[in-house]
Structures are given as structure tokens and as C-alpha cells.
């Protein structure tokens, strides 16, 4: 008789999840000499241990602590780029500006980027059929708790000027409910961070509005200022040109507004 299985509202675990995590770990540790000491089998065991045999709505940050310990990594605290709803451009930027880091440029972020996973209470099986949706099912699911945990730690590590890329095409350029708005903003350490510098990325070719005056950006400024961190904002009108100028600042077109 087939065992009854909980049906969740979200997509199931990414196919070949264990193999993908292990392969990514091996690749990352080969490319990054400072992480060569990491034992990828132990990393996978710790990752698996965080959610296997546990109810996928009862995951805690504590469940991920063994993985966090194994994935401990020092990134230059003044070279951190946060992002909200504009991941691709943020990643393109750090691919060019190699000394800056998004969360997904760290081992743990790289392992989990774009993946979904969950288990089932009291069985050692991975659920490939469905996983809890943050809104429709529960917020304490394996994926959400993982990203909340690593995002908090990443923000806590930041110092000096912290940069954040925001999507100017969204109705809420700054969204209090995003990971940036709900986790990272509140875990920047005022004794280490002098300034949060927002880059608002424009979508339309002819959009010359100053989106730094947007009400949601003013809300972000207010939250940051109350935390005794300075705030600054810059429009990036031409993201394509911006990336080109990061690659080659000598280019004559880089003298005008980007």
C-alpha cells in the first residue's frame, strides 16, 4: 500500500539535489584555494542533517549550525554587495569586479543558489514531489530558514560601506518583506558599518527619473538612519553601460552619467 505523503504548495526538491550540492562543493573548493581544506562529503552530511527526517515546517536556524560551522568563510567585510530582486545583474557585477562578493559568491550561497529541498518527518527520504511554500504553507521551511540564516550571518560580517543593488523596475524598489528588507538591513552592525550605499537599477532606456526619491527608498533611508548608519543612493540609468565601465573604466563613454 503506498504511504500517504503530505502535499505542499511549492515545487519539490530539485532533481539530483545531493549530487548537485556535492558537485558544486567540489567545484567551489577547487576554484577557491582558501576553502581547499573543506571536506565536501562532511558538508553534504551536515546539509542533509539539517532537514532529513524533520518536519519541513519545523526547521530552525539551529538545525543549520553544523553546516554553518563547516562553511565558515572569511570574505573582505568591506567588499560586500547585497541585492534585492536583481540577482542576475549583481552576479554579473561581481564576476567583473572580482574583489566584491554577493552571498552566492560564498561557499554556502553557491551550494544552494536556485535549489529547492525538503524532507519528511520520521523518514530519511527527500521529498521530490512538493515542498512547503513560504506564503501558502509555512515560513519555517528548509529553504527559507537556510537563506535567513546565511543572509543574517553575511550581513553581520559586513563593515565600512555596504552596497546594495535594488531593482528600480519593481513597484516596491525597497521591499520590507524581501530577505534584504527583513533580514539583512536589521543585521548590519552600526559599530562596523558606516554607510549603506544603494544602487537603484533602471529598467527603461528613457527612464531619467531620480528613483532615489522613491517613497520606498526614503523608507529604507529612515530605517537605516535610525540604526545610526549613514545612507546614500545612486541611480544607475544604464546598467549595460555600468557593467561595461566596471570592466573598462578607461572607456571614453564612462565619463558621462551611467
Amino acid at each position: 500500500v503506498p504511504r500517504w505523503r503530505q502535499q505542499w504548495s511549492g515545487p519539490g526538491t530539485t532533481k539530483r539535489f545531493p549530487e548537485t550540492v556535492l558537485a558544486r562543493c567540489v567545484k567551489y573548493t577547487e576554484i577557491h584555494p582558501e576553502m581547499r581544506h573543506v571536506d565536501c562529503q562532511s558538508v553534504w552530511d551536515a546539509f542533509k542533517g539539517a532537514f532529513i527526517s524533520k518536519h519541513p515546517c519545523n526547521i530552525t536556524e539551529e538545525d543549520y549550525q553544523p553546516l554553518m560551522k563547516l562553511g565558515t568563510q572569511t570574505v573582505p567585510c568591506n567588499k560586500i554587495l547585497l541585492w534585492s530582486r536583481i540577482k542576475d545583474l549583481a552576479h554579473q557585477f561581481t564576476q567583473v569586479q572580482r574583489d566584491m562578493f554577493t552571498l552566492e559568491d560564498t561557499l554556502l550561497g553557491y551550494l544552494a543558489d536556485d535549489l529547492t529541498w525538503c524532507g519528511e518527518f520520521n523518514t530519511s527520504k527527500i521529498n521530490y514531489q512538493s515542498c512547503p511554500d513560504w506564503r501558502k504553507d509555512c515560513s519555517n521551511n528548509p529553504v527559507s530558514v537556510f537563506w535567513k540564516t546565511v543572509s543574517r550571518r553575511f550581513a553581520e560580517a559586513a563593515c565600512d560601506v555596504v552596497h546594495v543593488m535594488l531593482n528600480g523596475s519593481r513597484s516596491k524598489i525597497f521591499d520590507k518583506n524581501s530577505t534584504f528588507g527583513s533580514v539583512e538591513v536589521h543585521n548590519l552592525q552600526p559599530e562596523k558599518v558606516q554607510t549603506l550605499e544603494a544602487w537603484v537599477i533602471h529598467g527603461g532606456r528613457e527612464d531619467s527619473r531620480d528613483l532615489c526619491q522613491d517613497p520606498t527608498i526614503k523608507e529604507l533611508e529612515s530605517i537605516i538612519s535610525k540604526r545610526n548608519i549613514q545612507f546614500s543612493c545612486k541611480n544607475i540609468y544604464r546598467p549595460d553601460k555600468f557593467l561595461q565601465c566596471v570592466k573598462n573604466p578607461e572607456d571614453s563613454s564612462c565619463t558621462s552619467e551611467i
Partner: nanobody, 122 residues
Framework: QVKLQESGGRLVQPGGSLRLSCAAS????????MAWFRQGPGKEREFVAS???????LYADFVKGRFTISRDNAKNTVYLQMDSLKPEDTTVYYC????????????????WGQGTQVTVSS
């Protein structure tokens, strides 16, 4: 190519004020982070302050509350307002530029001025 020229350095009494200027030619500064460093004889170049393309500022602990960095993109000039000067602020001050982001490490700046001497003495 960016050319930077510092000015404003002179002899000033302890507790006095001074404003250093750094004028850029060759291209507009609006997309550039600008910084001030200082270096005494036989010493490492030391970060003082920076201002990014988006005007966010960063200061060394030893100048916080005493020095202020600012920029005027229309004049293509960056300033360092130095207040409550101390004898230990005596040295040569350099202006530097790099694309977009201000950082503390001198090695990350592509363009440098020739420097201006500041002497704090009674």
C-alpha cells in the same frame, strides 16, 4: 586619463583648520570614487577618507569628527576640510581616484596626484 592636482597645503597652528582641494582634469569625476591618503617620510601610505560615486563617505578612525570629505562634480573637484589639526597630522596629503567605489586600500586606486604638504606647528 585622469589627472589630479592637489592644493591648499600650508603651515597652520595646532587646533587650526585647512581645506585641501583636488582638481581633476581629463574626465568628469561623477562616476569616480575619490580619496585622500597621507604619507610621511619612510612610512606607508595611510588612508584618510573617501567619497564614492554615490557620495557615501568613509573615514579613518583617527580623523573621524575632525575631517570632512566632499565633492563638487560641477567643478570636478574634491575637498578635504581639516579641523582641530594636531602636530601629528603633519605630512604630505595625496588625492586618488578609482571607478565608482571608495575603499581604504591605496593599491586599489588607479590615479594619483603629486601631493600637498601640510605642516601643523606653533
Amino acid at each position: 586619463q585622469v589627472k589630479l592636482q592637489e592644493s591648499g597645503g600650508r603651515l597652520v597652528q595646532p587646533g587650526g583648520s585647512l581645506r585641501l582641494s583636488c582638481a581633476a582634469s581629463g574626465r568628469t569625476l561623477s562616476n569616480y570614487a575619490m580619496a585622500w591618503f597621507r604619507q610621511g617620510p619612510g612610512k606607508e601610505r595611510e588612508f584618510v577618507a573617501s567619497i564614492s560615486a554615490s557620495d557615501s563617505t568613509l573615514y579613518a578612525d583617527f580623523v573621524k569628527g575632525r575631517f570632512t570629505i566632499s565633492r563638487d562634480n560641477a567643478k570636478n573637484t574634491v575637498y578635504l576640510q581639516m579641523d582641530s589639526l594636531k602636530p601629528e597630522d603633519t605630512t604630505v596629503y595625496y588625492c586618488a581616484a578609482r571607478f565608482w567605489i571608495g575603499v581604504r586600500a591605496p593599491a586599489e586606486y588607479n590615479y594619483w596626484g603629486q601631493g600637498t604638504q601640510v605642516t601643523v606647528s606653533s
